[in-house]
C-alpha cells in the first residue's frame, strides 16, 4: 500500500494550526471498517492519533489533533495539529493498514517571527569620536535560533567584536541579544539584522550616533 506524504517539511507558525498531509489509494469497495490508521511520533513511537474499526479513536496528544473524517474514505489520512508549539517540531509517521499496509513520515518545522529589534547604547551620553561604545540589539520570541548580522551606515558588514547570545524561554522561543563593540567615528549608523532562517524573515534595527566635536583644553 503506497502511503504518500510531502517531501518537504511542513512549516507552521507557533500558535497556528498545521495540517500534516498523508494519503493512500483505497481500492474499490473500500470501507472505513477495514481501515487502521495510526499517527505516531517517529523518534519515540508515542501515539498521536488513531482510527480503528470504523471509529476515530481520538487524540492521544494533548487533545490537539484531529483527522478529517469526511475525507478518510477518499484516502485522505491527514492530521490536523492545533495550536502548534515549539515542542511539536519533529517527524510524524502515518501508518495505514487495510488489507495491505504502508507508512511514511512527514516533518513538522515550527517557526515564530522575531520582534523588531530594540537598540541600546552604553554609554549613552557625552559620546565623542574615538570613544568605545557597546551597542546591544535585542529581539524577542522567535524560533528557530536567529542569524544576526551587523553593518555600518555604508552597508559594510561588521563581524569583529560581536557577541551574540540566544536564550530559550519556557515555550522554547528564543530571545536574541547581540552586542557590538565599536570605536565611534565623527558620526555613524549601525544596523542590526535579525534573520529567521526558516521564514526567511528579517527584522531590522538601527541606531545613529552623532559624535560631539572634539574639544581641547
Amino acid at each position: 500500500l503506497e502511503v504518500q506524504v510531502p517531501e518537504d517539511p511542513v512549516v507552521a507558525l507557533v500558535g497556528t494550526d498545521a495540517t500534516l498531509c498523508c494519503s493512500f489509494s483505497p481500492e474499490p469497495g473500500f470501507s472505513l471498517a477495514q481501515l487502521n490508521l495510526i499517527w505516531q511520533l517517529t523518534d519515540t513511537k508515542q501515539l498521536v492519533h488513531s482510527f480503528a474499526e470504523g471509529q476515530d479513536q481520538g487524540s492521544a496528544y494533548a487533545n490537539r489533533t484531529a483527522l478529517f473524517p469526511d475525507l478518510l474514505a477518499q484516502g485522505n489520512a491527514s492530521l490536523r495539529l492545533q495550536r502548534v508549539r515549539v515542542a511539536d517540531e519533529g517527524s510524524f509517521t502515518c501508518f495505514v493498514s487495510i488489507r495491505d499496509f504502508g507508512s511514511a513520515a512527514v516533518s513538522l518545522q515550527v517557526a515564530a517571527p522575531y520582534s523588531k529589534p530594540s537598540m541600546t547604547l552604553e554609554p549613552n551620553k557625552d559620546l565623542r569620536p574615538g570613544d568605545t561604545v557597546t551597542i546591544t540589539c535585542s529581539s524577542y520570541r522567535g524560533y528557530p535560533e536567529a542569524e544576526v548580522f551587523w553593518q555600518d551606515g555604508q552597508g559594510v558588514p561588521l563581524t569583529g567584536n560581536v557577541t551574540t547570545s540566544q536564550m530559550a524561554n519556557e515555550q522554547g522561543l528564543f530571545d536574541v541579544h547581540s552586542v557590538l563593540r565599536v570605536v565611534l567615528g565623527a558620526n555613524g549608523t549601525y544596523s542590526c539584522l535579525v534573520r529567521n532562517p526558516v521564514l526567511q524573515q528579517d527584522a531590522h534595527g538601527s541606531v545613529t550616533i552623532t559624535g560631539q566635536p572634539m574639544t581641547f583644553p
Epitope: N36, I98, F101
Partner: antibody, heavy 123, light 107 residues
Framework: QVQLVESGAEVKKPGASVKLSCKAS????????MHWVRQAPGQRLEWMGE????????NYNEKFKSRVTITVDKSASTAYMELSSLRSEDTAVYYC????????????????WGQGTLVTVSS | DIQMTQSPSSVSASVGDRVTISCRAS??????LAWYQQKPGKAPRLLIY???SLDSGVPSRFSASGSGTDFTLTISSLQPEDFATYYC?????????FGQGTRLEIK
C-alpha cells in the same frame, strides 16, 4: 552480518537485581531500536521494553516499568537491561532483539535475536 | 493490553501435510501481525510480518492471511525442519504481546 552476543547465565536470590548486556555488531548500532524479550520455561514470549540507541528514548511494558531499566553504551555498541527486586517468576531466558524494520509497523518486528541469557532466581 | 490467542495449542502432523494455525486478537489490529518460529533451545525467527508478507529467506510453503482480529498461518507441505513452536505477535500497540504458542509435533 548482524550479531547480538549476550552475557552469560546468572543465578540470583529473590530481591536481588541482575544486569544483562548485549553486544551488537554488523550494523550501525544507533540505527536499530533494541528490545528485551523474555521467555519463562514453557511460557509465551513477553516483551519487556525497548530503547532507541540514537536518542536514548525508552518504552517499557507497564508490567515491568517499576523494575526494569534499559540503557545503552553507544561507544561500546552495547545495550543493557537491569531488572530489580527479582522473584522466582522472573526465572526465564532473556533475549535482546534488534529491529531494523522500523517504521514498517507502529511498534516492532523482532528480526535479529541474541542467543539468550538464562536467569535463575532461587533462594 | 491486546490479548493474542492461538489455536490449537498443539497439533500433530506428518511430513507433507498441510497445517493451519490460527491467531485471534482481542481487538482489531489491522494487518500489523507477525508470526515467529521457535525451535527448542533456540531464539525465535521472524517468518511473516504485516499479516501476509514473507520475511527474506522464508520458504514459500509458508503463507499467512487475515486482518482485523482473525489471522492464519499455513504450511502447505510440512518438512522435517518445520516441527517447532509458532507464535503470533501484534505490532500495533504497546505493550507488544504474543500468542501463547502452537506446538507442531510429528505424528
Amino acid at each position: 552480518q548482524v550479531q547480538l552476543v549476550e552475557s552469560g547465565a546468572e543465578v540470583k536470590k529473590p530481591g536481588a537485581s541482575v544486569k544483562l548486556s548485549c553486544k551488537a555488531s554488523g550494523y550501525t548500532f544507533s540505527s536499530y531500536w533494541m528490545h528485551w524479550v523474555r521467555q519463562a520455561p514453557g511460557q509465551r514470549l513477553e516483551w519487556m521494553g525497548e530503547i532507541n540507541p540514537g536518542n536514548g528514548h525508552t518504552n517499557y511494558n507497564e508490567k515491568f516499568k517499576s523494575r526494569v531499566t534499559i540503557t545503552v553504551d553507544k561507544s561500546a555498541s552495547t545495550a543493557y537491561m537491569e531488572l530489580s527486586s527479582l522473584r522466582s517468576e522472573d526465572t526465564a531466558v532473556y533475549y535482546c532483539v534488534a529491529d531494523p524494520r522500523r517504521p514498517k509497523v507502529p511498534t516492532a518486528l523482532f528480526v535479529y535475536w541474541g542467543q539468550g541469557t538464562l536467569v535463575t532466581v532461587s533462594s | 493490553d491486546i490479548q493474542m490467542t492461538q489455536s490449537p495449542s498443539s497439533v500433530s502432523a506428518s511430513v507433507g501435510d498441510r497445517v493451519t494455525i490460527s491467531c485471534r486478537a482481542s481487538q482489531g489490529i489491522g494487518t500489523w501481525l507477525a508470526w515467529y518460529q521457535q525451535k527448542p533451545g533456540k531464539a525465535p525467527r521472524l517468518l511473516i510480518y504485516a499479516a501476509s508478507s514473507l520475511d527474506s529467506g522464508v520458504p514459500s510453503r509458508f503463507s499467512a492471511s487475515g486482518s482485523g482480529t482473525d489471522f492464519t498461518l499455513t504450511i502447505s507441505s510440512l518438512q522435517p525442519e518445520d516441527f517447532a513452536t509458532y507464535y503470533c505477535q501484534q505490532a500495533i500497540n504497546f505493550p507488544i504481546t504474543f500468542g501463547q504458542g502452537t506446538r507442531l509435533e510429528i505424528k
